[in-house]
C-alpha cells in the first residue's frame, strides 16, 4: 500500500530572466527513493538517479542545474517556461509518486511565491 505524500513548492511565480528552484519532498513512507524524474508537459527536463547520477535533457542543458538535493534549478526564465512541472519519485517497494508544481513567469517584478501544498 502506498502511504507516502509528496510536498511541493506548489504554485510559484518568478521574474523573466531570473531563476527558480523546483523542489519536492516525499514523506510518510519508508520506501527507498531510487530515482526522481523532472518533467514539463510532454518532455523530460532531468533525471536524478541515486546511483547513476544526473541526466539533463539536451534542450535544457544550458538552463538547468542539478539540485539542491533532488530538486532542480531552472535559470534564465522566459514566459514560455510558464506551465506545469512534475516530479516523479520512483521508490521501492511503493512504486511511483507524482507531485505537481505550477510556475508562472512574470514580466514584472511582483513575482510572489505561492503556498506549499500536498498531493497524496
Amino acid at each position: 500500500m502506498m502511504t507516502g505524500t509528496i510536498e511541493t513548492t506548489g504554485n510559484i511565480s518568478a521574474e523573466k530572466g531570473g531563476s527558480i528552484i523546483l523542489q519536492c519532498h516525499l514523506s510518510s513512507t519508508t520506501a527507498q527513493v531510487t530515482q526522481v524524474n523532472w518533467e514539463q508537459q510532454d518532455q523530460l527536463l532531468a533525471i536524478c538517479n541515486a546511483d547513476l547520477g544526473w541526466h539533463i535533457s539536451p534542450s535544457f542543458k544550458d538552463r538547468v542545474a542539478p539540485g539542491p538535493g533532488l530538486g532542480l534549478t531552472l535559470q534564465s526564465l522566459t514566459v514560455n517556461d510558464t506551465g506545469e512541472y512534475f516530479c516523479i519519485y520512483h521508490t521501492y517497494p511503493d512504486g511511483t509518486y507524482t507531485g505537481r508544481i505550477f510556475l508562472e513567469v512574470l514580466e514584472s517584478s511582483v513575482a510572489e511565491h505561492g503556498a506549499r501544498f500536498q498531493i497524496p
Epitope: 531510487t34 530515482q35 524524474n37 518533467e39 510532454d42 518532455q43 523530460l44 533525471i47 538517479n49 541515486a50 546511483d51 547513476l52 547520477g53 544526473w54 541526466h55 539533463i56 535533457s57 539536451p58 534542450s59 542543458k61 542539478p66 520512483h90
Partner: antibody
Framework: QVQLVQSGAEVVKPGASVKISCKTS????????MHWVKQAPGQRLEWIGG????????RNNQKFKGRATLTVDTSASTAYMELSSLRSEDSAVYYC????????????WGQGTLVTVSS | DIQMTQSPSSLSTSVGDRVTITCKAS??????VVWYQQKPGKAPKLLIY???YRYTGVPSRFSGSGSGTDFTFTISSVQPEDFATYYC?????????FGQGTKLEIK
C-alpha cells in the same frame, strides 16, 4: 581520443565465475558512469547495470542481482564486471559502455567480450 | 520493467529509399529514448538521443522524434553503409531496456 578496451574471450564451465575488464583512456574516468550490456546470440541487447566511478554507487538490473558485481579501479581507469554461477544462457557478448557527463546516452562502447559457458 | 517494441523486425529496402522504424514503450517514458546502430560483430553506435538530437558526427539523413510512448526513427535516404540493425532504448527508469531490433537489409 576516448577508448574502451575490453579483456579477451573466455570459455568457462557452468557454475563458475568470470571477470571481464574494461580499460579506459582519453577522458576523466571518474566523471562518467560505466555500464555493462549483454548480447546473447539472436537476442536483444540487455542492460546489466551501471556504476558511478566517482562515488562507487551501482544500479543493477534485478535479473542479474546477486550474480553480476560491478566494480572500478579508479587508479587504473578500469571497470570490471564479475558474473557468477554461470549457466549456458549466460553465453553472450558483453559490452562495457560509458554514458556522457550528465547524460544517460551511452556514447562510447568497448569492442565486446565473448563469454562461452560450456562443460 | 518497461518493454520496448520495435516494428518492423526486419526491413528490405534499396539505396535512396526513405525508411521509418517505430518504437513503442509499454508505459510513459517521456523523451528518454535513444537509438543505436549495430553492424555484425561490432559494438552498437549511438545515433540519436533525447529522442531527436543527432550525436556528434551522425549524418543529417538520420532523425528521430516522439514523446510519451511512441517514437520514430527515420533514414531519409538510405546509403549502402546504413544496412545494419537498429535498436531503440529507454533510460526513463531502471532497468534500462532495449527494443528487439530492426534489421535493415538490401532488397
Amino acid at each position: 581520443q576516448v577508448q574502451l578496451v575490453q579483456s579477451g574471450a573466455e570459455v568457462v564451465k557452468p557454475g563458475a565465475s568470470v571477470k571481464i575488464s574494461c580499460k579506459t583512456s582519453g577522458y576523466t574516468f571518474t566523471e562518467n558512469t560505466m555500464h555493462w550490456v549483454k548480447q546473447a546470440p539472436g537476442q536483444r541487447l540487455e542492460w546489466i547495470g551501471g556504476i558511478n566511478p566517482n562515488q562507487g554507487g551501482n544500479r543493477n538490473n534485478q535479473k542479474f542481482k546477486g550474480r553480476a558485481t560491478l566494480t572500478v579501479d579508479t587508479s587504473a581507469s578500469t571497470a570490471y564486471m564479475e558474473l557468477s554461477s554461470l549457466r549456458s544462457e549466460d553465453s553472450a557478448v558483453y559490452y562495457c559502455a560509458r554514458s556522457g557527463l550528465r547524460d544517460y546516452a551511452m556514447d562510447y562502447w568497448g569492442q565486446g567480450t565473448l563469454v562461452t559457458v560450456s562443460s | 520493467d518497461i518493454q520496448m517494441t520495435q516494428s518492423p523486425s526486419s526491413l528490405s529496402t534499396s539505396v535512396g529509399d526513405r525508411v521509418t522504424i517505430t518504437c513503442k514503450a509499454s508505459q510513459h517514458v517521456s523523451t528518454a529514448v535513444v537509438w543505436y546502430q549495430q553492424k555484425p560483430g561490432k559494438a552498437p553506435k549511438l545515433l540519436i538521443y533525447s529522442p531527436s538530437y543527432r550525436y556528434t558526427g551522425v549524418p543529417s539523413r538520420f532523425s528521430g522524434s516522439g514523446s510519451g510512448t511512441d517514437f520514430t526513427f527515420t533514414i531519409s535516404s538510405v546509403q549502402p553503409e546504413d544496412f545494419a540493425t537498429y535498436y531503440c532504448q529507454q533510460h526513463y527508469s531502471t532497468p534500462w531496456t532495449f527494443g528487439q531490433g530492426t534489421k535493415l537489409e538490401i532488397k
